[in-house]
């Protein structure tokens, strides 16, 4: 069929979306590519309820989400409107800090150890979360 009725193996279903939680780290762009290879995207947090769900699964670990300002304004990777949407930044974040000495500022958003968001250098190898909508991708096959 053309519509997925259940999540792929090792993905977690929640509110008509499927989530995959990595257990190793990658730069933001590599994590983004890995999600796209699976017809998914880095997680887009649209509500406090979704925030709590993701936070529960990742624990107190820095984890990339699908939010960045590499081209100027903050943007969600799936086109969800940033200005009117859900936000959960840490106090005084995002700050585009240049003091890390790695060159440039901070253009990619991640969950911090308490779940609130911070902007950081996109090259840092953090864990990541992929998300895909249940009615978007093709039907899940049996394991080969």
């Amino acid at each position: 069929g053309s519509e997925r009725t259940c999540c792929p193996v090792n993905w977690v279903e929640h509110e008509r979306s499927c989530y995959w939680f990595s257990r190793s780290g990658k730069a933001w762009a590599d994590a983004d590519n890995y999600c796209r290879l699976e017809d998914a995207h880095l997680v887009v947090v649209t509500s406090w309820e979704e925030q709590k769900f993701v936070q529960h699964h990742i624990g107190p670990v820095n984890t990339w989400m699908g939010l960045h300002d590499q081209n100027g304004p903050w943007k969600w990777v799936d086109g969800t409107d940033y200005e009117t949407g859900f936000k959960n930044w840490r106090p005084e974040q995002p700050d585009d800090w240049y003091g890390h000495g790695l060159g440039g500022g901070e253009d990619c958003a991640h969950f911090t150890d308490d779940g609130r968001w911070n902007d950081d250098v996109c090259q840092r190898p953090y864990r990541w979360v992929c998300e895909t909508e249940l009615d978007k991708a093709s039907q899940e096959p049996p394991l080969l």
Epitope: P8, V9, A29, N33, Y34, E38, S138, P141, P142
Partner: antibody
Framework: EVQLLESGGGLVQPGGSLRLSCAAS????????MSWVRQAPGKGLEWVSA????????FYADSVKGRFTISRDNSKNTLYLQMNSLRAEDTAVYYC???????????????WGQGTLVTVSS | DIQMTQSPSSVSASVGDRVTITCRAS??????LAWYQQKPGKAPKLLIY???SFQSGVPSRFSGSGSGTDFTLTITSLQPEDFATYYC?????????FGPGTKVDIK
């Protein structure tokens, strides 16, 4: 049993075009990312391109970007590689390969076709 | 791009020998590494993925280890059908890259 069968290779002049096909069977084709990998005569392996299961996301090696286009027809269980502006250095055996799922094994080339030879020469 | 190197480039061995091939990545790739076997005129075959996991049907004499930048493929007791070229490949980031290969031939 997973099977991948490439076709479309042959002799082409520099600057010419060729379209490779890969017919897939034995798995749910639309659920897996696919890739092309090439091997120049007597040389090692070089990843060329990859495409997600839906065909909505594509990835290319810098050496072919802008010249090659990967695509797929899930209704026909077929993967394609359109090769334009071919150069002598594109001469190679081109393999079609299935990619494993990131959440199961990781995106490794778990099944390969037998390859089709592309020769670019005047 | 992540560069992959292998050593040795070739090794001569006898049936029953233990053969060790090493692979090094130019930057850390965690365990996003695979090993492939290729025989002349044939397509490569996946042996090991995620640095140390066996692909289905691969004999237990093959094993992989390592993490970060340094990896090893070991064949504990070389069999006649193991004479081939072995490639490592990183799947940590695009573009996926392969090592130059290690040819295992008969001494």
């Amino acid at each position: 049993e997973v099977q991948l069968l490439e076709s479309g290779g042959g002799l082409v002049q520099p600057g010419g075009s060729l379209r490779l096909s890969c017919a897939a069977s034995g798995f749910t084709f639309s659920s897996y990312a696919m890739s092309w990998v090439r091997q120049a005569p007597g040389k090692g392996l070089e990843w060329v391109s990859a495409i997600s299961g839906s065909g909505g996301n594509t990835f290319y090696a810098d050496s072919v970007k802008g010249r090659f286009t990967i695509s797929r027809d899930n209704s026909k269980n077929t993967l394609y590689l359109q090769m334009n502006s071919l150069r002598a250095e594109d001469t190679a055996v081109y393999y079609c390969a299935k990619l494993g799922r990131i959440a199961v094994t990781g995106p490794y080339f778990d099944y390969w076709g037998q390859g089709t030879l592309v020769t670019v020469s005047s | 791009d992540i560069q992959m190197t292998q050593s040795p480039s070739s090794v001569s061995a006898s049936v029953g020998d233990r053969v060790t091939i090493t692979c090094r990545a130019s930057q850390a790739i965690n365990d996003w590494l695979a090993w492939y076997q290729q025989k002349p005129g044939k397509a490569p075959k996946l042996l090991i993925y995620a640095a140390s996991s066996f692909q289905s049907g691969v004999p237990s004499r093959f094993s992989g280890s390592g993490s970060g930048t340094d990896f090893t493929l070991t064949i504990t007791s070389l069999q006649p059908e193991d004479f081939a070229t072995y490639y490592c490949q990183q799947a940590s980031s695009f573009p996926f890259t392969f090592g130059p290969g290690t040819k295992v031939d008969i001494k």
